[in-house]
Interface confidence: low
Protein backbone atom coordinates (compact mmCIF):
# COMPACT_ATOMS: atom_id res chain seq x y z
CA UNK A 1 0.00 0.00 0.00
CA UNK A 2 1.29 3.45 -1.26
CA UNK A 3 0.76 6.66 0.52
CA UNK A 4 -1.01 9.51 -1.41
CA UNK A 5 -1.64 12.97 -0.56
CA UNK A 6 -5.34 14.24 -0.17
CA UNK A 7 -6.73 17.94 0.28
CA UNK A 8 -10.04 18.95 1.57
CA UNK A 9 -10.97 22.32 2.50
CA UNK A 10 -10.70 22.79 6.69
CA UNK A 11 -13.89 24.04 7.23
CA UNK A 12 -17.67 24.23 5.77
CA UNK A 13 -20.85 25.20 7.11
CA UNK A 14 -23.86 23.00 5.99
CA UNK A 15 -26.30 25.26 4.47
CA UNK A 16 -30.13 26.01 6.28
CA UNK A 17 -31.46 23.39 4.29
CA UNK A 18 -28.74 20.79 5.65
CA UNK A 19 -26.45 20.37 2.61
CA UNK A 20 -22.67 20.98 2.72
CA UNK A 21 -20.67 20.17 -0.66
CA UNK A 22 -16.60 20.54 -0.59
CA UNK A 23 -13.74 18.91 -2.89
CA UNK A 24 -12.20 16.98 -2.43
CA UNK A 25 -8.49 16.55 -4.33
CA UNK A 26 -5.79 13.92 -4.36
CA UNK A 27 -2.37 13.79 -6.23
CA UNK A 28 -2.84 10.62 -8.33
CA UNK A 29 1.13 9.44 -8.81
CA UNK A 30 -0.45 7.47 -12.01
CA UNK A 31 -3.39 7.01 -14.40
CA UNK A 32 -5.66 5.21 -12.24
CA UNK A 33 -8.39 3.61 -14.21
CA UNK A 34 -10.90 3.06 -11.14
CA UNK A 35 -11.40 5.21 -8.10
CA UNK A 36 -12.95 4.58 -4.54
CA UNK A 37 -13.61 7.60 -2.58
CA UNK A 38 -15.10 7.10 0.75
CA UNK A 39 -16.52 9.71 3.91
CA UNK A 40 -16.10 9.14 6.92
CA UNK A 41 -17.32 11.14 10.21
CA UNK A 42 -15.28 11.48 12.95
CA UNK A 43 -16.81 12.44 16.21
CA UNK A 44 -15.97 11.74 19.66
CA UNK A 45 -12.91 9.72 18.37
CA UNK A 46 -15.61 7.31 17.20
CA UNK A 47 -15.16 7.27 12.88
CA UNK A 48 -18.02 5.88 11.10
CA UNK A 49 -18.32 5.80 7.05
CA UNK A 50 -20.98 7.74 5.81
CA UNK A 51 -21.13 7.20 2.38
CA UNK A 52 -18.60 5.37 -0.64
CA UNK A 53 -18.42 5.56 -4.50
CA UNK A 54 -16.46 3.35 -6.49
CA UNK A 55 -15.83 5.09 -10.39
CA UNK A 56 -14.21 5.05 -13.25
CA UNK A 57 -11.89 7.58 -14.44
CA UNK A 58 -13.84 9.53 -17.13
CA UNK A 59 -17.36 8.66 -15.66
CA UNK A 60 -20.03 9.60 -13.30
CA UNK A 61 -19.02 9.52 -10.08
CA UNK A 62 -22.53 7.31 -8.35
CA UNK A 63 -23.48 6.80 -5.03
CA UNK A 64 -25.46 3.96 -4.03
CA UNK A 65 -29.33 4.56 -3.91
CA UNK A 66 -29.23 4.39 0.31
CA UNK A 67 -26.56 7.44 0.27
CA UNK A 68 -26.95 10.82 1.57
CA UNK A 69 -23.66 11.43 -0.37
CA UNK A 70 -24.11 12.89 -4.20
CA UNK A 71 -20.70 13.39 -5.73
CA UNK A 72 -19.03 14.20 -9.57
CA UNK A 73 -15.12 13.77 -10.43
CA UNK A 74 -13.23 15.42 -12.76
CA UNK A 75 -9.70 15.23 -13.29
CA UNK A 76 -8.23 14.21 -9.50
CA UNK A 77 -11.20 16.44 -7.98
CA UNK A 78 -13.83 14.95 -6.39
CA UNK A 79 -16.76 17.39 -5.80
CA UNK A 80 -18.63 15.92 -2.62
CA UNK A 81 -22.40 16.75 -1.82
CA UNK A 82 -24.21 15.83 1.18
CA UNK A 83 -27.52 15.96 2.29
CA UNK A 84 -30.19 15.81 4.81
CA UNK A 85 -27.73 17.45 7.71
CA UNK A 86 -28.84 18.19 11.20
CA UNK A 87 -26.88 19.77 13.97
CA UNK A 88 -26.41 16.76 15.56
CA UNK A 89 -24.30 15.55 12.42
CA UNK A 90 -21.60 18.39 12.93
CA UNK A 91 -18.58 16.88 12.97
CA UNK A 92 -15.20 16.22 10.94
CA UNK A 93 -15.91 14.27 7.52
CA UNK A 94 -12.28 12.99 6.20
CA UNK A 95 -12.07 12.09 2.45
CA UNK A 96 -10.50 8.81 1.65
CA UNK A 97 -9.25 7.86 -1.91
CA UNK A 98 -8.13 4.27 -3.03
CA UNK A 99 -6.82 4.07 -6.42
CA UNK A 100 -7.85 0.42 -7.02
CA UNK A 101 -7.16 -0.17 -10.06
CA UNK A 102 -4.28 -0.92 -11.95
CA UNK A 103 -1.69 -2.11 -9.46
CA UNK A 104 -0.08 -0.46 -7.32
CA UNK A 105 -2.44 0.00 -4.45
CA UNK A 106 -2.23 3.45 -3.41
CA UNK A 107 -4.62 5.21 -0.24
CA UNK A 108 -4.91 8.43 0.55
CA UNK A 109 -6.68 10.31 3.78
CA UNK A 110 -7.17 13.94 3.89
CA UNK A 111 -6.77 15.80 7.12
CA UNK A 112 -10.63 15.99 7.36
CA UNK A 113 -13.46 19.09 6.79
CA UNK A 114 -15.56 20.34 9.89
CA UNK A 115 -18.93 20.36 8.63
CA UNK A 116 -20.81 23.01 10.86
CA UNK A 117 -24.39 22.06 11.28
CA UNK A 118 -27.06 24.74 12.44
CA UNK A 119 -30.91 23.67 12.61
CA UNK A 120 -33.17 26.28 11.50
CA UNK A 121 -35.41 27.98 13.78
CA UNK A 122 -38.94 26.09 13.15
CA UNK A 123 -41.74 28.85 11.56
CA UNK A 124 -44.20 29.03 13.30
CA UNK A 125 -47.86 28.26 12.18
CA UNK A 126 -49.53 30.31 9.32
CA UNK A 127 -52.59 30.79 7.81
CA UNK A 128 -51.19 31.47 4.60
CA UNK B 1 -43.16 -6.34 -18.09
CA UNK B 2 -39.81 -6.71 -17.05
CA UNK B 3 -37.96 -9.92 -17.68
CA UNK B 4 -34.67 -10.89 -17.17
CA UNK B 5 -33.78 -14.17 -19.08
CA UNK B 6 -30.50 -16.14 -18.38
CA UNK B 7 -28.55 -18.88 -20.12
CA UNK B 8 -28.81 -22.04 -19.81
CA UNK B 9 -26.15 -24.66 -17.33
CA UNK B 10 -22.90 -24.78 -18.01
CA UNK B 11 -20.36 -27.35 -16.65
CA UNK B 12 -17.00 -26.78 -16.73
CA UNK B 13 -13.60 -28.01 -16.06
CA UNK B 14 -11.06 -26.60 -13.10
CA UNK B 15 -9.46 -23.30 -14.65
CA UNK B 16 -11.63 -22.75 -17.67
CA UNK B 17 -13.48 -19.99 -18.34
CA UNK B 18 -17.49 -19.09 -18.18
CA UNK B 19 -19.11 -16.68 -20.13
CA UNK B 20 -23.18 -16.17 -19.16
CA UNK B 21 -25.71 -14.18 -20.25
CA UNK B 22 -28.59 -11.91 -19.51
CA UNK B 23 -31.38 -10.95 -21.55
CA UNK B 24 -33.01 -7.90 -20.33
CA UNK B 25 -36.55 -6.88 -21.69
CA UNK B 26 -39.94 -4.84 -20.82
CA UNK B 27 -38.02 -1.23 -19.82
CA UNK B 28 -35.14 0.80 -20.74
CA UNK B 29 -31.72 -1.22 -20.58
CA UNK B 30 -29.61 1.92 -20.18
CA UNK B 31 -31.68 3.41 -17.46
CA UNK B 32 -30.35 0.76 -14.92
CA UNK B 33 -27.31 -0.58 -13.51
CA UNK B 34 -27.29 -4.57 -13.47
CA UNK B 35 -25.77 -6.51 -10.99
CA UNK B 36 -24.71 -10.42 -10.24
CA UNK B 37 -25.26 -12.14 -7.12
CA UNK B 38 -24.31 -15.78 -7.04
CA UNK B 39 -25.49 -18.82 -4.62
CA UNK B 40 -23.77 -22.14 -3.59
CA UNK B 41 -26.06 -24.90 -3.14
CA UNK B 42 -27.85 -24.52 0.58
CA UNK B 43 -25.38 -21.35 0.56
CA UNK B 44 -26.12 -17.41 1.03
CA UNK B 45 -25.95 -14.88 -1.34
CA UNK B 46 -22.76 -13.51 -2.95
CA UNK B 47 -22.52 -10.05 -4.40
CA UNK B 48 -20.41 -10.09 -7.39
CA UNK B 49 -20.38 -6.82 -9.06
CA UNK B 50 -22.64 -4.45 -11.09
CA UNK B 51 -21.65 -2.62 -14.23
CA UNK B 52 -23.53 0.91 -15.29
CA UNK B 53 -24.97 -0.27 -19.46
CA UNK B 54 -24.82 3.18 -20.15
CA UNK B 55 -21.20 4.04 -19.43
CA UNK B 56 -20.19 0.76 -19.16
CA UNK B 57 -18.28 1.41 -15.34
CA UNK B 58 -18.36 -1.52 -13.10
CA UNK B 59 -17.63 -1.98 -9.44
CA UNK B 60 -16.60 -5.15 -8.44
CA UNK B 61 -16.58 -7.35 -5.01
CA UNK B 62 -12.75 -7.08 -4.50
CA UNK B 63 -13.09 -11.07 -3.79
CA UNK B 64 -13.68 -11.53 -7.77
CA UNK B 65 -11.50 -8.43 -8.91
CA UNK B 66 -9.63 -9.39 -11.88
CA UNK B 67 -11.23 -12.97 -12.29
CA UNK B 68 -14.90 -11.60 -13.01
CA UNK B 69 -15.30 -9.15 -15.96
CA UNK B 70 -18.76 -7.26 -16.33
CA UNK B 71 -19.58 -6.25 -20.44
CA UNK B 72 -23.21 -4.85 -22.09
CA UNK B 73 -24.08 -5.31 -25.53
CA UNK B 74 -26.71 -2.72 -25.51
CA UNK B 75 -27.67 -3.64 -29.32
CA UNK B 76 -28.98 -6.58 -27.94
CA UNK B 77 -29.98 -5.38 -24.27
CA UNK B 78 -27.68 -8.23 -22.75
CA UNK B 79 -25.21 -7.94 -19.87
CA UNK B 80 -22.92 -10.90 -19.30
CA UNK B 81 -20.57 -12.28 -17.04
CA UNK B 82 -17.11 -14.10 -17.60
CA UNK B 83 -15.52 -15.36 -14.84
CA UNK B 84 -12.01 -17.39 -15.24
CA UNK B 85 -9.49 -19.75 -13.66
CA UNK B 86 -12.62 -21.76 -12.37
CA UNK B 87 -12.59 -23.32 -9.17
CA UNK B 88 -14.60 -26.49 -7.71
CA UNK B 89 -16.09 -23.59 -4.76
CA UNK B 90 -17.17 -21.33 -8.09
CA UNK B 91 -19.88 -23.96 -8.39
CA UNK B 92 -23.02 -22.03 -8.06
CA UNK B 93 -26.05 -20.35 -9.55
CA UNK B 94 -25.53 -17.14 -11.06
CA UNK B 95 -28.22 -14.44 -10.65
CA UNK B 96 -28.46 -10.90 -12.89
CA UNK B 97 -30.43 -8.87 -10.81
CA UNK B 98 -31.49 -5.00 -11.88
CA UNK B 99 -30.81 -2.33 -9.79
CA UNK B 100 -33.34 0.73 -9.00
CA UNK B 101 -33.28 4.17 -8.43
CA UNK B 102 -35.09 6.34 -6.35
CA UNK B 103 -38.44 5.95 -7.74
CA UNK B 104 -37.93 1.62 -8.47
CA UNK B 105 -36.79 -0.32 -5.79
CA UNK B 106 -33.32 -2.05 -6.06
CA UNK B 107 -33.13 -5.94 -6.84
CA UNK B 108 -36.97 -6.15 -7.34
CA UNK B 109 -36.15 -8.27 -10.71
CA UNK B 110 -34.11 -11.25 -11.05
CA UNK B 111 -32.81 -13.61 -13.51
CA UNK B 112 -33.84 -17.36 -13.23
CA UNK B 113 -30.46 -18.13 -12.22
CA UNK B 114 -28.06 -20.26 -14.30
CA UNK B 115 -25.99 -23.20 -12.61
CA UNK B 116 -22.48 -23.41 -13.47
CA UNK B 117 -20.86 -26.86 -12.24
CA UNK B 118 -17.21 -26.79 -12.02
CA UNK B 119 -15.81 -30.41 -12.03
CA UNK B 120 -12.89 -32.59 -13.03
CA UNK C 1 -16.89 -4.33 4.13
CA UNK C 2 -20.09 -4.65 6.42
CA UNK C 3 -20.69 -7.90 7.82
CA UNK C 4 -24.69 -8.82 8.17
CA UNK C 5 -25.31 -11.37 10.81
CA UNK C 6 -29.06 -12.97 11.03
CA UNK C 7 -30.09 -14.51 14.05
CA UNK C 8 -31.48 -17.22 14.29
CA UNK C 9 -30.06 -19.37 11.58
CA UNK C 10 -33.13 -21.57 11.85
CA UNK C 11 -36.36 -20.83 13.32
CA UNK C 12 -38.80 -23.47 14.06
CA UNK C 13 -42.51 -22.30 14.76
CA UNK C 14 -46.06 -23.01 13.85
CA UNK C 15 -48.61 -21.56 11.22
CA UNK C 16 -50.66 -18.70 13.50
CA UNK C 17 -47.04 -17.68 15.62
CA UNK C 18 -45.43 -14.53 15.75
CA UNK C 19 -41.99 -15.12 13.99
CA UNK C 20 -38.87 -12.25 15.02
CA UNK C 21 -36.19 -12.50 12.34
CA UNK C 22 -33.26 -10.13 13.40
CA UNK C 23 -30.28 -8.82 10.77
CA UNK C 24 -27.11 -6.65 12.91
CA UNK C 25 -24.37 -5.20 10.68
CA UNK C 26 -20.86 -4.35 11.54
CA UNK C 27 -21.41 -0.57 10.64
CA UNK C 28 -24.09 1.68 10.46
CA UNK C 29 -26.30 1.40 7.70
CA UNK C 30 -28.43 3.89 6.32
CA UNK C 31 -31.21 1.34 5.21
CA UNK C 32 -31.77 -2.69 5.51
CA UNK C 33 -33.86 -5.03 2.86
CA UNK C 34 -35.05 -8.20 3.10
CA UNK C 35 -35.31 -10.86 0.61
CA UNK C 36 -37.39 -14.36 0.33
CA UNK C 37 -36.29 -17.45 -0.99
CA UNK C 38 -38.03 -20.81 -1.65
CA UNK C 39 -36.02 -23.62 -2.83
CA UNK C 40 -35.07 -24.10 -6.18
CA UNK C 41 -36.45 -20.45 -6.76
CA UNK C 42 -35.04 -16.70 -7.13
CA UNK C 43 -34.60 -14.67 -3.92
CA UNK C 44 -37.73 -12.13 -4.12
CA UNK C 45 -37.10 -8.74 -3.06
CA UNK C 46 -39.56 -8.76 0.42
CA UNK C 47 -39.32 -5.30 2.33
CA UNK C 48 -36.96 -2.29 1.41
CA UNK C 49 -35.43 0.79 2.96
CA UNK C 50 -36.37 -0.65 6.43
CA UNK C 51 -39.72 -0.72 6.23
CA UNK C 52 -41.66 -0.49 2.60
CA UNK C 53 -43.73 -4.07 1.46
CA UNK C 54 -42.75 -5.05 -1.77
CA UNK C 55 -45.40 -5.08 -4.54
CA UNK C 56 -48.00 -8.19 -3.35
CA UNK C 57 -46.02 -8.99 -0.10
CA UNK C 58 -49.27 -9.30 2.77
CA UNK C 59 -49.64 -6.51 5.47
CA UNK C 60 -48.89 -9.58 8.31
CA UNK C 61 -44.92 -9.08 6.87
CA UNK C 62 -43.25 -5.21 8.86
CA UNK C 63 -39.75 -4.33 8.74
CA UNK C 64 -38.02 -1.84 11.43
CA UNK C 65 -34.97 -0.84 12.81
CA UNK C 66 -32.15 1.94 12.49
CA UNK C 67 -28.58 1.50 12.54
CA UNK C 68 -27.01 -1.36 13.19
CA UNK C 69 -30.10 -3.41 14.41
CA UNK C 70 -32.63 -4.71 12.08
CA UNK C 71 -35.62 -6.92 12.42
CA UNK C 72 -38.24 -8.68 10.09
CA UNK C 73 -41.28 -9.45 11.90
CA UNK C 74 -44.47 -11.81 10.40
CA UNK C 75 -47.04 -10.58 13.03
CA UNK C 76 -49.30 -14.26 12.28
CA UNK C 77 -47.90 -16.79 10.33
CA UNK C 78 -49.58 -18.49 7.01
CA UNK C 79 -47.99 -21.45 5.58
CA UNK C 80 -46.56 -19.93 2.47
CA UNK C 81 -44.65 -17.77 4.66
CA UNK C 82 -42.00 -20.56 5.81
CA UNK C 83 -38.86 -19.88 3.63
CA UNK C 84 -35.38 -18.54 4.03
CA UNK C 85 -34.99 -14.51 4.51
CA UNK C 86 -31.68 -12.69 3.35
CA UNK C 87 -30.67 -9.14 4.90
CA UNK C 88 -28.92 -6.84 2.37
CA UNK C 89 -27.18 -3.53 2.96
CA UNK C 90 -26.48 -1.12 -0.18
CA UNK C 91 -25.08 1.74 2.41
CA UNK C 92 -21.28 0.69 0.79
CA UNK C 93 -19.63 -1.42 -1.37
CA UNK C 94 -19.22 -4.22 -1.84
CA UNK C 95 -22.80 -4.47 -1.29
CA UNK C 96 -23.34 -7.29 1.28
CA UNK C 97 -26.12 -10.44 2.60
CA UNK C 98 -26.73 -12.05 6.25
CA UNK C 99 -26.23 -15.64 5.84
CA UNK C 100 -30.00 -15.83 6.16
CA UNK C 101 -32.79 -17.17 8.57
CA UNK C 102 -34.59 -20.39 7.43
CA UNK C 103 -37.95 -20.15 8.87
CA UNK C 104 -39.40 -23.68 8.91
CA UNK C 105 -42.92 -25.38 10.22
CA UNK C 106 -42.39 -26.95 13.89
Known amino acids: CKAMHVAQPAVVLASSRGIASFVCEYASPGKATEVRVTVLRQADSQVTEVCAATYMMGNELTFLDDSICTGTSSGNQVNLTIQGLRAMDTGLYICKVELMYPPPYYLGIGNGTQIYVIDPEPCPDSDF | EVQLVQSGAELKKPGASVKMSCKASGYTFTDYNMDWVRQAHGKGLEWIGN????????SYNQKFKGRATLTVDKSSSTAYMELRSLRSDDTAVYYC?????????????WGQGTLVTVSS | EIVLTQSPATLSLSPGERATLSCSAS?????MHWFQQKPGKAPKLWIYSTSILASGVPARFSGSGSGTDYTLTISRLEPEDFATYYC?????????FGQGTKLEIK
Open chain 3, 27 to 31: SSVTY
Open chain 3, 88 to 96: QQRTSYPLT
Open chain 2, 51 to 58: INPNSEST
Open chain 2, 97 to 109: TRDGNRYDAWFAY
